[in-house]
Interface confidence: low
């Protein structure tokens, strides 16, 4: 949000006399720096210093003691903190020309003579004059090439492959550049970048491998950013595949991984000839050792109805891949002897899902089931109890005379899961017992009648009712009921 720095002189361009000195002042609201045409080796006569002044602004002065043709170019003043490698410098610019009658063109590095163009794209042949007034023509093997010229940049146009020469005349003297070689490369307007990490979870000591592939482009700069980058821990490789189409495969390998190598692995591909950029990222985690986590989707006590089909699903997170087995009452589940099946499927890289399936639940399926997951570093288990719910049924209803005392006990045995409740009813008028309204529930607190209940095992219960004295014929009904059903029998 800082306003752009200001430059004095406040001009877009300035012509400076050969061998004279010149200075450029930059004012900014934060610390400012200069970017200028020459490389650091060539810039011995360029001095940059900070200047104290009474403006409250940061002032940086660029001074050239003896201007030469090589000083011709764009000078940019920018805020230090805004400079990033990717984007063009955002700042204030001034273009300086230093006309030299003996140097018509600004000296260039050898790489500048290689001009890379993409299929039918425009390009710049960077022959820049030291004097803005110098007329320039562009030639190739066929003669003069029509192209627009800007002394700050060079010739701009659509050029066919081959050598090009810039020609200028200064005070009757002819100057020619060495040939600029225009070279065409395969490139697309969008970068097709794919990242592949066969694994994203590792443990200490393993080798991390990540690849990025760029399709249909020859002019690509690819940078890796990853946690171990500062230590230079990774090994990068490039493989160029030409058939059936161009594919550049960049591989990053990080051997002997540690927990510190966990984090984001990013590849950023950039086209060398245009501002097209694409990036892909994957998060890699490195664990000190292998691990297992078990997450059941049900509780530790589960019920199933008789003959029901039911699935019990357990989510497992593990690395390295686990072996998963099921036990029933601490014995390995032998699936072919029961109507119980288990399976394991891989959901994601380190996520697995195991299912225990009851096809038609039977009473004998009740018990303790355990899932065990293990790998070379860890073992985890989860146990739950399964109850097969059986509707209540009466097994037996008998009476027992007490001889001379005239007392009588009726015993009712019932089974079911959950254990049935037993209720007693009596009908005192035998002739009317077909009518439900003639039956009354036997209350516990009636004198001369005692009711008791005893469970014989987990699924069998026995109820008793004792009549101290039976003076007339009565009918007795035993009602056994649980969540799944009720049954009654009469005596």
């Amino acid at each position: 949000q800082l306003s752009l720095p200001s430059i004095l002189p406040n001009e877009n361009e300035k012509v400076v006399q050969l061998n004279s000195s010149f200075s450029l002042r930059c004012f900014g609201e934060s610390e400012v720096s200069w970017q200028y045409p020459m490389s650091e080796e060539e810039s011995s006569d360029v001095e940059i210093r900070n200047e104290e002044n009474n403006s409250g602004l940061f002032v940086t002065v660029l001074e050239v003691s003896s201007a030469s043709a090589a000083h011709t170019g764009l000078y940019t003043c920018y805020y230090n903190h805004t400079q990033t490698e990717e984007n063009e410098l955002e700042g204030r610019h001034i273009y300086i020309y230093v006309p030299d009658p003996d140097v018509a063109f600004v000296p260039l590095g050898m790489t500048d003579y290689l001009v890379i163009v993409e299929d039918d794209d425009s390009a710049i042949i960077p022959c820049r004059t030291t004097d803005p007034e110098t007329p320039v023509t562009l030639h190739n093997s066929e003669g003069v090439v029509p192209a627009s010229y800007d002394s700050r940049q060079g010739f701009n146009g659509t050029f066919t492959v081959g050598p090009y020469i810039c020609e200028a005349t200064v005070k009757g003297k002819k100057f020619q550049t060495i040939p600029f070689n225009v070279y065409a490369l395969k490139a697309t307007s969008e970068l097709d970048l794919e990242m592949e990490a066969l694994k994203t979870v590792y443990k200490s000591g393993e080798t991390i491998v990540v690849t990025c592939a760029v399709f249909n482009n020859e002019v690509v700069d690819l940078q890796w950013t990853y946690p171990g980058e500062v230590k230079g821990k990774g090994i990068t490789m490039l493989e160029e595949i030409k058939v059936p189409s161009i594919k550049l495969v960049y591989t990053l390998t990080v051997p002997e991984a540690t927990v510190k190598d966990s984090g984001d692995y990013e590849c950023a591909a950039r086209q060398a000839t245009r501002e097209v950029k694409e990036m892909k990222k994957v998060t890699i985690s490195v664990h000190e050792k292998g691990f297992i986590e078990i997450k059941p989707t049900f509780s530790q006590l589960e019920a199933v109805n008789l003959h029901e089909v039911k699935h019990f699903v357990v989510e497992v997170r593990a690395y390295p891949p686990p072996r998963i087995s099921w036990l029933k009452n601490n014995l390995t589940l032998i699936e072919n002897l029961t109507e119980i099946t288990t399976d394991v499927e891989k959901i994601q890289e380190i996520r697995y899902r195991s299912k225990l399936k009851l096809i038609r639940a039977k009473e004998e399926d009740s018990g303790h089931y355990t899932i065990v997951a293990q790998n070379e570093d860890a073992v985890k288990s989860y146990t739950f109890e399964l109850l097969t719910q059986v509707p209540s049924s009466i097994l037996d209803l008998v009476d027992d005379h007490h001889g001379s005392t005239g007392g009588q006990t009726v015993r009712c045995t019932a089974e079911g899961t959950p254990l049935p409740d037993i209720e007693w009813m009596i009908c005192k008028d035998i002739k009317k017992c077909n009518n439900e309204t003639s039956w009354t529930i036997l209350a516990n607190n009636v004198s001369n009648i005692i009711t008791e209940i005893h469970s014989r095992d987990r699924s069998t219960v026995e109820g008793r009712v004792t009549f101290a004295k039976v003076e007339e014929t009565i009918a007795v009904r035993c009602l056994a009921k649980n969540l799944l059903g009720a049954e009654n029998r009469e005596l």
Partner: antibody
């Protein structure tokens, strides 16, 4: 020596208009952002707005945007503040300043809004 | 708008004491903060800019620190002439805003 001199203040009726000027000297006026700041009697400082060197960007404090207009004339080295629809709460000492922050402020011109 | 809060309207101190004035921004303003001194009947006088840079000619007993949302202005040894109102200002984003001011009184 850098100098900023405000003028144009005075007594104005509620709903009226007034144009303040700030004459700059001693520096290259054409490369600096310029600001207006005001201070009501006995109160703190309130930033009014700023204008960039070529007048292509002008920023105002939102509550004053519809009643104040900042402009400049680089040829005359002068900054302006056109005030309209003034109210009693616009009574203040009006300062012009070089940049968004900085050491160079004028001495201020007093605007009094009263019936 | 970014609100700059100076928690103390008044601070009382003695000559030779160390005094710190705080300013809190309602959101991150990086280091785009200036501190001004204003004496009665005068225009504000810049002391610190960019949070910690002392302006030319300002005595080194005045210092500034902080970044983000919390800023501190310190006078290491108060002098009688330091009696004034001190303002912080953010110039990170428009509208630029000032703190309410802290009046330094000498006992």
């Amino acid at each position: 020596e850098v100098k900023l001199l405000e003028s144009g203040g005075g007594l104005v009726q509620p709903g009226g208009s007034l144009k303040l000027s700030c004459a700059a000297s001693g520096f290259d006026f054409s490369i600096f952002w310029m600001s207006w700041v005001r201070q009501a009697p006995g109160k703190g400082l309130e930033w009014i707005g700023e204008i960039n060197p070529d007048s292509s960007t002008i920023n105002y404090t939102p509550s004053l945007k519809d009643k104040f207009i900042i402009s400049r004339d680089n040829a005359k080295n002068t900054l302006y503040l056109q005030m309209s629809k003034v109210r009693s709460e616009d009574t203040a000492l009006y300062f012009c300043a070089r940049q968004r922050f900085g050491p160079y402020w004028g001495q201020g011109t007093l605007v009094t809004v009263s019936a | 708008d970014i609100v700059m809060t100076q928690s103390h309207k008044f601070m009382s101190t003695s000559v030779g004491d160390r005094v710190s004035i705080t300013c809190k921004a309602s959101q991150d303003v990086s280091t785009a903060v200036a501190w001004y001194q204003q004496k009665p009947g005068q225009s504000p006088n810049l002391l610190i800019y960019s949070a910690s840079y002392r302006y030319t000619g300002v005595p080194d007993r005045f210092t500034g620190s902080g970044s983000g949302t919390d800023f501190t202005f310190t006078i290491s040894s108060v002098q009688a002439e330091d009696l004034a109102v001190y303002y912080c200002q953010q110039y990170y984003s428009t509208p630029y805003t000032f703190g309410g001011g802290t009046k330094l009184e000498i006992k």
